[in-house]
Interface confidence: medium
């Protein structure tokens, strides 16, 4: 049956899926706040452009009866459930905002003729790559694999003079949604990361990880994991670590490293943290005041989703083009729009580009310092601290394979 879009005659709506299962355990009121703040900005921007139109959001809540685990791993049915609701209501907006879980996005994409754009704050997995009408506003796993390969290969920096081609990956299955899919992409045999490495082994047990830290026969000095410092501490504790071990801790959506008076705990000295450069204005905006540092990015992605909708609306209306066309549905990519905290760039496949930041712990100050940045848009690593006060020998990152000489 045909679903009509509330998307013409000066009235434009965005349908926001409010799912109990979301990529981050975020109260739905906070998501609503972000959406409403975004709508206010969009209305102002359209008015300033001389476009006298109405813009609203319709929130679609799942009943949570069948699947109320609040966990993305059980989200497949919930997305379809919401699609059924849209189908029964026979109406939706110009754009669908949500879902954020990889399973539900993938399933919705499989089971529907998406003639309208879908914006997601999440959908991190490789299975959501290269979808023609899907836009992802939080760094997907593909972007992480590109950084890691680029960094592994780099060998011409003052602090990294060896190319790496090996790695352990710690993945125990209890990770958050973002981490689950990031590590999944590193584990997948078909992924870019796997293709480019000569050795890769996934460690699934705590004991396996703990043993590697001092194992003289280890096959790599590099361990990739995902989570926050507390997660690492629970796993590593105060165990001794061989001097040429490098732990890469992926913690993209966590601003805590940049807060004033943060001191890096001693167990972080062998660790490089991969995170994102945080926005400035997020710290005191009304919608993020009650959010923890980890939740800001999720709420911001919703807000930016609304601003993207507004940007595309403005572009099409100014050009006198129809909103309910395949052209509109496929237009949410290969562009830069004015986000809440500055310009937001989407690549050719509608995935957000960002600046990733690799941090190290200064042995002098016990502070996190920026070692380098990585621009996902141009796939380029830029050194920042050219003389880091590392724990590693000679202020250089070690080789990924220890030369043990004749045995």
């Amino acid at each position: 049956s045909q679903v009509s879009q509330n998307c013409h005659n000066g009235s434009y709506e965005i349908s926001v899926l409010m799912m109990d299962n979301s990529a981050f355990a975020e109260p739905l009121e906070n998501v609503e706040d972000a959406v409403n703040e975004g709508l206010e900005i969009v209305r102002g921007r359209l008015q300033n452009a001389g476009l006298n139109v109405t813009v609203n959001a319709s929130f679609m809540y799942s009943d949570g009866l069948i699947h109320n685990s609040g966990d993305c791993r059980s989200s497949t049915c919930e997305g379809l459930d919401l699609l059924r609701k849209i189908s029964n209501a026979k109406r939706m907006g110009c754009v669908l905002m949500g879902p954020s879980c990889t399973y539900s996005t993938f399933q919705m994409y499989l089971d529907t003729e998406l003639s309208y754009p879908m914006i997601s704050a999440g959908s991190f997995g490789l299975s959501c790559d290269y979808k023609e009408t899907l836009t992802r506003l939080m760094s997907p796993a593909r972007k992480l694999t590109y950084f890691l390969v680029n960094f592994w290969k780099t060998n011409d920096l003052p602090f990294k003079t060896y190319s790496w081609s090996t790695s352990y990956v710690y993945k125990n299955g209890t990770e958050s949604e973002d981490c689950f899919w990031y590590l999944n992409a590193l584990e997948a045999s078909v992924s870019y990361f796997s293709h480019e490495l000569s050795f890769k082994l996934v460690l699934r047990q705590d004991k396996e990880f703990q043993d590697i830290l001092m194992d003289h026969n280890r096959k790599s000095n590099v361990i990739v994991m995902c989570g926050d410092p507390e997660f690492l501490y629970k796993l590593k504790g105060d165990r001794a670590v061989a001097e040429d071990i490098v732990i890469i801790l992926v913690d993209l959506f966590n601003d805590q490293y940049f807060e004033d008076n943060v001191t890096a705990p001693d167990y972080m000295k062998n660790v490089l943290v991969l995170t994102r450069s945080p926005g400035n204005s997020l710290l005191n905006s009304s919608f993020s005041r009650n959010l923890s540092p980890t939740k800001r990015d999720f709420a911001l992605a919703y807000l930016n989703g609304i601003l993207l909708f507004g940007h595309m609306l403005k572009t099409f209306l100014e050009n006198g083009e129809n909103i309910t066309t395949p052209k509109f549905a496929h237009a949410f990519r290969n562009l830069t729009f004015e986000g809440y905290d500055g310009p937001v760039t989407l690549d050719d496949w509608g995935d957000v580009d960002s600046t990733m930041v690799l941090l190290y712990t200064s042995v002098d100050t016990k502070k996190y310092k920026v070692l380098l940045t990585y621009d996902t848009h141009v796939n380029q690593t830029n050194p920042v601290d050219m003389s880091p006060t590392f724990t590693w020998k000679n202020s250089k990152l070690p080789n990924d394979i220890t030369d043990r000489g004749p045995q």
Partner: antibody, heavy 122, light 110 residues
Framework: QVQLQQSGAELARPGASVKLSCKAS????????ITWVKRRTGQGLGWIGE????????YYNEKFKGKATLTADKSSSTAYMELRSLTSEDSAVYFC???????????????WGTGTTVTVSS | DIVLTQSPASLAMSLGKRATISCRAS??????????IHWYQQKPGQPPKLLIH???NLEAGVPARFSGSGSRTDFTLTIDPVEEDDVAIYYC????????FGGGTKLEIK
């Protein structure tokens, strides 16, 4: 006070090499980097590269790789820059400067040497 | 490389007036809320002297007549009021990526 004393003017033939020095005093030499900057008459400033005496690590502008080699002697608190295969394009004033880092991790230049004039002529 | 474009290339000011020099970067030079742009003054026959670091922080010993502002890609050095001693070439420098200087702005007195 913090000072960077550079060696005297150099006159060299095309194809030759010169080694300029920059002696630091008034601060802990190994706690900072030393950067080198070129200024040609009627032109602006061009960044050549940096050396971090504590580790001996160097960082070059691609344009000067193969042209300039940076070294440092911790015992005498002196940084050196050797320029080789000189041409008339290398005639310029060369400055050394102290590179200071911040919590963000970037480096900028707070104290400068007096400059060394290099003239390449046959 | 990041290109820094300074304008104007030269500036003739009356004593006591306000001089503003612009430095525009070809891409953002901000990192974690910090603007990695620095301003230098070079007088004839002298080495450059640091005036302002990180866009707006006045270096110790530099007169308060000098101030800096801006963020991301657009930065301004302001001298107010201009004095005789300010005749020099002013350069901006970015330390966000491989270091680059602006082309310089020559300040003269009318």
């Amino acid at each position: 006070q913090v000072q960077l004393q550079q060696s005297g003017a150099e006159l060299a033939r095309p194809g030759a090499s010169v080694k300029l020095s920059c002696k630091a005093s008034g601060y802990t030499f190994t706690s900072y980097g030393i950067t080198w900057v070129k200024r040609r008459t009627g032109q602006g400033l061009g960044w050549i590269g940096e050396i971090y005496p504590r580790s001996g690590n160097t960082y070059y502008n691609e344009k000067f790789k193969g042209k300039a080699t940076l070294t440092a002697d911790k015992s005498s608190s002196t940084a050196y820059m050797e320029l080789r295969s000189l041409t008339s394009e290398d005639s310029a004033v060369y400055f050394c400067a102290r590179a200071i880092t911040t919590v963000v991790g970037d480096w900028y230049f707070d104290v400068w040497g007096t400059g060394t004039t290099v003239t390449v002529s046959s | 490389d990041i290109v820094l474009t300074q304008s104007p290339a030269s500036l003739a000011m009356s004593l006591g007036k306000r001089a503003t020099i612009s430095c525009r970067a070809s891409e953002s030079v901000s990192l974690i809320g910090t603007n990695l742009i620095h301003w230098y003054q070079q007088k004839p026959g002298q080495p450059p002297k640091l005036l302002i670091h990180h866009a707006s922080n006045l270096e110790a010993g530099v007169p308060a007549r000098f101030s800096g502002s801006g963020s991301r890609t657009d930065f301004t050095l302001t001298i107010d009021p201009v004095e005789e001693d300010d005749v020099a070439i002013y350069y901006c420098l970015q330390s966000r990526k491989i270091r680059t200087f602006g082309g310089g702005t020559k300040l003269e007195i009318k």
